[in-house]
């Protein structure tokens, strides 16, 4: 989160979150500015001349969404400023000086979460925006499945799945004979050999993707697929 | 800020061939897709060619299909254009670019963030 100092008698937190596409989403901490002052948040590129992305506040959250052109790239970075106005004149603080999306990336749940279900196993596959299909060997995601009639409290999860859209779940992991749901969330990896820590993307997960239900298929033995394990 | 550098350029005879480098500095190269345009004297700058960030995809302008060829190393973070038959009309300055397509085509400038300085190619009939 970014914290920025206002002029007044108190400070102001700002969560921006970024889609790693074109859209970032803040949310902040004191919305009580009274009636009629409209605040907004500005975004100046520090990098495109000319660049600024108004983020107008309702309430305690606002969203950006940028023009095409301007689809985030890893080496962005902005100047936040908060803009309000008060009796009569424009009132500006600095929010963040470096804002750099990429370590602030919230990513947009998979979408078209399927299940094929054949003898001894379920192959889950899903679908990302085609925009972050660039960057698909720094996606990872966590798998949650259950009984359709346990609480996602009771689900099991399997995680560390990076860089694969698909995922075999095989019968032996599941309850014969009953319905199962699954769901996948997504986030940044962090890679390995990211030794240098400023140019990783950092973040947190995304929200759940809509739950898929499928048939716990009939035990048999393991599947190997010819592409090996993800 | 990732940073272009184009090199390879020079004076060659119709006919004749040369190969263009494009080096770039940045951790996520392999996230970009690269171009390269073109710009000749007192016209415009023109699309040339392009490849996708994983190296799958190419596309050429219809001028220079057949005799140029994109290609790109995310281990050394360079794009190649292997540019062969030249002609007189192929005399320009030709840049590099990167940038992550998303709504426009690879032939459109808007699509590319970053750009080199360019590199000089001149054929001579």
């Known amino acids: 989160s970014v914290t920025g100092e206002g002029q007044g008698p108190r400070s102001r937190t700002f969560t921006c979150l970024t889609n790693n596409i074109l859209r970032i989403d803040c949310h902040w901490s004191a919305p009580e500015l009274g009636q009629g002052s409209s605040p907004w948040l500005l975004f100046t590129s520090n990098q495109a001349p000319g660049g600024t992305h108004k983020c107008i506040l309702r309430g305690s959250e606002c969203t950006v969404v940028l023009p095409p052109e301007a689809v985030l790239v890893p080496s962005d970075n902005f100047t936040i400023t908060f803009h309000h106005c008060m009796s009569g004149r424009e009132q500006v603080s600095l929010v963040d000086p470096e804002y750099l999306p990429r370590r602030h990336v919230k990513l947009d749940p998979p979408s078209d979460l399927q299940s094929n279900i054949s003898s001894g196993h379920c192959i889950l596959t899903w679908s990302i925006s085609p925009a972050l299909e660039p960057m698909t060997t720094l996606l990872s995601y966590e798998l949650a499945f259950k009984k359709q009639e346990e609480a996602w409290e009771q689900a099991q999860h399997r995680d560390h799945i990076v860089g694969v859209t698909w995922l075999i779940l095989e019968a032996f992991e599941l309850d014969p004979g009953f319905i199962h749901e699954a769901r996948l969330r997504v986030q940044m990896a962090t890679l390995e050999d990211d030794v240098v820590e400023e140019e990783r993307y950092t973040g947190q997960w995304s929200e759940w993707s809509q739950p898929v239900c499928f048939q716990a298929p009939q035990r048999q033995g393991p599947l190997i697929p010819p592409w090996g394990w993800p | 800020q990732v940073q272009l550098v184009e090199s390879g350029g020079g004076l060659v005879q119709a006919g004749g061939s040369l190969r263009l480098s494009c080096a770039a500095s940045g951790r996520y190269f392999y996230t970009y897709g690269m171009g390269w345009f073109r710009q000749a004297p007192g016209k415009e700058r023109e699309f040339v060619a392009a490849?996708?960030?994983?190296?799958?995809?190419?596309y050429y302008a219809d001028s220079v299909k057949g005799r140029f060829t994109i290609s790109r190393d995310n281990a050394k973070n360079t794009v190649y254009l292997q540019m062969n038959s030249l002609k007189p009309e192929d005399t320009a300055v030709y840049y590099c670019?990167?940038?992550?397509?998303?709504?426009?085509?690879?032939?459109?400038?808007?699509?590319?963030?970053?750009w080199g300085q360019g590199t000089q190619v001149t054929v001579s009939s």
């Open positions: 670019a990167a940038g992550r397509w998303y709504y426009y085509g690879p032939e459109y400038q808007i699509t590319y963030r970053y």
């Open positions: 490849i996708s960030n994983e190296g799958g995809s190419t």
